[in-house]
């Protein structure tokens, strides 16, 4: 039910990467506005993006309070200029989102190779530990801080002169690989959470090759 010129939101979708989390929906509003509610850990509904004409709402501040919690949101539709108006059943039209558990579902952002250093026939490759918007004790946690050992990285590396790729894995943000002396290598990394059933892998990092600025060489 609801007023005749108000339509319910649909296609509610969570878009989340490294815990930056936005709820999106349709349709673009015509003579109506939207308000979002998100359930907190006490199962109370908290209002966000009140009276917006956008079709998205940034809920990051709410979900980072407990990334292991399973959240539910809903989008309420009101006639434009009357956010207090309700339908014939005494409440606005609304549509529920799918449930969303940030720890299990946020996409892993594209990682970045922070540095690589060659010492003889070994190369140390370090992956940048990206900061998230998750806080603990007033500090922002890194991806590693949040996921711990659930997060691994896979390194793909190959000689610049060939296409045959090798792989290495690590439970930290560092690799130490054997290379042939006098050969240049290229590197790309991918973040993986093996225990997940969805969104297990990030996209590959940009490729970095020896002989470029990020690298360092020591005999």
């Amino acid at each position: 039910s609801g007023t005749t010129n108000t339509v319910a939101a649909y296609n509610l979708t969570w878009k989340s990467t490294n815990f930056k989390t936005i709820l999106e929906w349709e349709p673009k509003p015509v003579n109506q506005v939207y308000t979002v509610q998100i359930s907190d850990r006490s199962r109370n509904w908290k209002y966000k993006c009140t009276g917006t004409t956008d079709t998205e709402c940034d809920l990051t501040d709410e979900i980072v309070k407990d990334v292991n919690w399973t959240y539910e949101a809903r989008v309420l539709s009101y006639p434009a200029g009357n956010v207090e108006s309700t339908g014939s059943a005494g409440e606005p039209l609304y549509e529920n989102s799918p449930e969303f558990t940030p720890y299990l579902e946020t996409n892993l952002g594209q990682p970045t190779i922070q540095s690589f250093e060659q010492v003889g026939t070994k190369v140390n490759v370090t992956v940048e530990d990206e900061r998230t918007l998750v806080r603990r004790n007033n500090t922002f946690l890194s991806l590693r801080d949040v996921f711990g050992k659930d997060l691994i990285y896979t390194l793909y590396y190959w000689k610049s002169s060939s296409s045959g790729k090798k792989t290495a894995k690590t439970n930290t943000n560092e690799f130490l690989i054997d290379v042939d002396k006098g050969e240049n290598y290229c590197f790309s990394v991918q973040a993986v959470i093996p225990s997940r059933t969805v969104n297990r892998k990030s996209t590959d990092s940009p490729v970095e090759c020896m002989g470029q600025e990020k690298g360092e060489f020591r005999e």
């Epitope: 990285y153 290495a168 894995k169």
Partner: antibody, heavy 125, light 108 residues
């Protein structure tokens, strides 16, 4: 040289909460390692309880998860175990351990390389 | 959970003999996460081998580890008196981390 020392009551009554603390000396608890609790029932094998990172990130054994809380206090260089609603089946030697990264096959993986001496906890009325 | 089954339960051998301990997993274990521990009575376990085959610093070279997938082996080439103890394999790749039931190496 990192050393670990468990402390806490040796006797806990059924239905109460078992609380143990592990004090880390000779190194910082915030230095990129994980910190684990393991127990060993009398005359039996080892059972992993759970682990914590200095950031507070935890992993628990699902068989105990509903009763276990592991926390860390970086200011005191300590981490703690709480096990609620204990029964006689929780009588065991409880060990704390450091999980440190070791190089293997191009990457680094964590192994429990430093252990406390263990503390015996008996659950009895 | 991954169940690790160790055999034999007890191994009775004399000093100088070779000990072969088996650890079989209920499903494939990445070698990177396979470790062996030694435990003597009244003591905490001690890390011997990690990555299925790499000796921890200070562990004598008479200890060696091998295997992959579901079958892993710890070999003590020549038993010394101080080697008589209980040995556990452990996997730390899948939660819950699990230990085998142990193999007791006793003096014959």
């Amino acid at each position: 040289q990192v050393q670990l020392q468990e402390s806490g009551p040796g006797l806990v009554k059924p239905s109460q909460t078992l609380s143990l603390t592990c004090t880390v000396s000779g190194g910082s608890i915030s230095s990129g390692q994980y910190w684990s609790w393991i127990r060993q029932h009398p005359g039996k094998g080892l059972e992993w309880i759970g682990e914590i990172y200095y950031s507070g990130s935890t992993r628990y054994n699902p068989s105990l998860k509903s009763r276990v809380t592991i926390s860390v206090d970086t200011s005191k260089n300590q981490f703690s175990l709480k096990l609620s609603s204990v029964t006689a089946a929780d009588t065991a030697v409880y060990y704390c351990a450091r999980d440190a990264p070791y190089y293997y096959g191009g990457g680094y993986y964590y192994y429990m390389d430093v252990w406390g001496k263990g503390t015996t906890v008996t659950v009895s009325s | 959970e991954i169940v690790l089954t160790q055999s034999p339960g007890t191994l009775s051998l004399s000093p100088g003999e070779r000990a072969t301990l088996s650890c079989r997993a209920s499903e494939s274990v990445d070698s990177s996460y396979l470790a062996w521990y030694q435990q003597k009575p009244g003591q905490a376990p001690r890390l011997l081998i990690y990555g299925a085959s790499t000796r921890q610093t200070g562990i004598p070279d008479r200890f060696s580890g091998s295997g992959s997938g579901t079958d892993f082996t710890l070999t003590i080439s020549r038993l010394e008196p101080e080697d008589f103890a209980v040995y556990y394999c452990q996997q730390a790749g899948v939660v819950p981390y699990t230990f085998g039931g142990g193999t007791k190496v006793e003096i014959k």
